[in-house]
């Protein structure tokens, strides 16, 4: 389940006498190229991340799906550590994401694409807890994008991360990760799951359909999406020019 090492080396950052803490710090010291970088958040060993540099500073790509090349139906330890290929599909790893965000509120950007060429970009203000909270995700402000605040559980509600072998969802009667697929902040199973099974066509059986990648309030519950990207950026004072 370890993330593959990239073929090309990480960019050099000469203005820091240590590894950058995150993509935002890279941006702050003048890096304007997006791509693979080695970072070292406070108290964490170094690791590679995909950075996207924008007018709002540096973002860290934490998830990418687009072709079904990587199996996302994995246990807790895999979701904690990360898996996949940084050049392709991957999950960065909950512990790595938490080491980047620390105790800060963050902005989470979610890019969705369906099979008809439609796309949606959403932004959330979130707080990610540590492993002691099962990496609970809490919305701290309303949702951005055309979809309004109905895209996820209500603001203020904290939703733990769940996998088939560590059931932390908000349903007492079932294990969302088992009845759906992959690991996710499942809540009551029905809102979204961007780590579900990759389907190239819509399965006929509902039981299989439920296991796909979906975002209920965009294309509808259980519509299997073609591609997703998730990015995160800790909130601080805006990045220095």
């Amino acid at each position: 389940p370890e993330m593959a090492q990239p073929v090309d080396p990480a960019h050099n950052v000469s203005r820091l006498h240590r590894l950058p803490r995150d993509c935002q710090e890279l941006f702050q010291v003048g890096e304007r190229q997006s791509g693979l970088f080695e970072i070292q958040p406070q108290g964490s060993p170094p690791f590679l991340v995909n950075c996207k540099m924008t007018s709002d500073g540096g973002w860290t790509v934490i998830q990418r799906r687009h072709d079904g090349s990587v199996d996302f139906n994995r246990p807790w330890e895999a979701y904690k550590a990360g898996f996949g290929d940084p050049h392709g599909e991957f999950w960065l790893g909950l512990e790595k994401v938490h080491s980047i965000t620390g105790d800060r509120n963050s902005r989470l950007a979610v890019q969705l694409r369906d099979w008809d060429g439609n796309a949606e970009l959403l932004q959330f203000s979130v707080h990610l807890g540590g492993e002691d909270t099962a990496y609970s995700l809490q919305l701290t402000a309303p949702v951005a994008g055309q979809l309004g605040a109905t895209t996820v559980p209500p603001s203020g509600l904290s939703v733990p991360f769940s996998t088939w072998d560590q059931d932390h969802d908000l349903r007492r009667d079932k294990n969302c990760a088992k009845s759906l697929s992959g690991g996710w902040w499942f809540g009551t199973c029905s809102h979204s799951n961007l780590n579900g099974q990759y389907f190239r066509s819509i399965p006929q059986q509902r039981q299989k359909l439920k296991k796909g990648i979906f975002w209920k309030t965009w294309r509808g519950r259980y519509y299997p999406l073609q591609a997703t990207t998730m990015l995160i950026q800790p909130m601080a004072a805006e990045a220095a020019s």
């Epitope: 090309d8 941006f27 304007r32 190229q33 997006s34 791509g35 996207k52 540099m53 924008t54 007018s55 709002d56 500073g57 973002w59 950007a109 890019q111 796309a119 970009l121 932004q123 951005a144 994008g145 055309q146 990207t229 990015l231 004072a237 805006e238 990045a239 220095a240 020019s241």
Partner: antibody, heavy 118, light 107 residues
Framework: EVQLVDSGGGLVQPGRSLKLSCAAS????????MAWVRQIPTKGLEWVAS????????YYRDSVKGRFTISRDNAKNTQYLQMDSLRSEDTATYYC???????????WGQGVMVTVSS | DIQMTQSPSFLSASVGDRVTINCKAS??????LNWYQQKLGEAPKRLIY???TLQTGIPSRFSGSGSGTDYTLTISSLQPEDFATYFC?????????FGPGTTLELK
Amino acid sequence: EVQLVDSGGGLVQPGRSLKLSCAASGFTFSNYGMAWVRQIPTKGLEWVASISSGGGNTYYRDSVKGRFTISRDNAKNTQYLQMDSLRSEDTATYYCARDPGITGFDYWGQGVMVTVSS
Amino acid sequence: DIQMTQSPSFLSASVGDRVTINCKASQNINKYLNWYQQKLGEAPKRLIYNTNTLQTGIPSRFSGSGSGTDYTLTISSLQPEDFATYFCLQHNSFPGTFGPGTTLELK
């Protein structure tokens, strides 16, 4: 529906000033970076300036640094480009563009012509 | 700065033709490449972003491909409304740079 409406262009003498405006609607303006891009017939499209979603950070191409100021008023859903000490080489069509960052410029205003000539 | 080159600069084609326009970056741009269409007197309109994602409302005859430094826009069957100028934009390096454009005209 996302809409960006540019205004404020015109004919101005070298060394004088002009202020462009871009009124945005159909999306949560305060969540998006914004930019100005200009088009010079002989040089094609070139980025001029960008501003972060909150307005705290601004970025400029070297040739306009110290002369142009990009700003925004999130309460009015409007971004601006204050152009001072204008030069003949600033003559162009100026477009306001929305910049989600992750996907590059997506929506553009209709553009305004700025002509710097004596 | 990343330099973008486009080929060809001019292209003459007929309705129904399949055409390809190429964009080359001076370094790897990690698939952060957009394509825009611009008609005379109008603002650029985004067709494709991040190499191959079709902008909502754009016909499926437009498609994009590529990786590293080389990218292609393909129009599978030219329609009368497709005669215009096409630009690429790299946004791997903030704030991005545009290609010089390809003018597609009726043969």
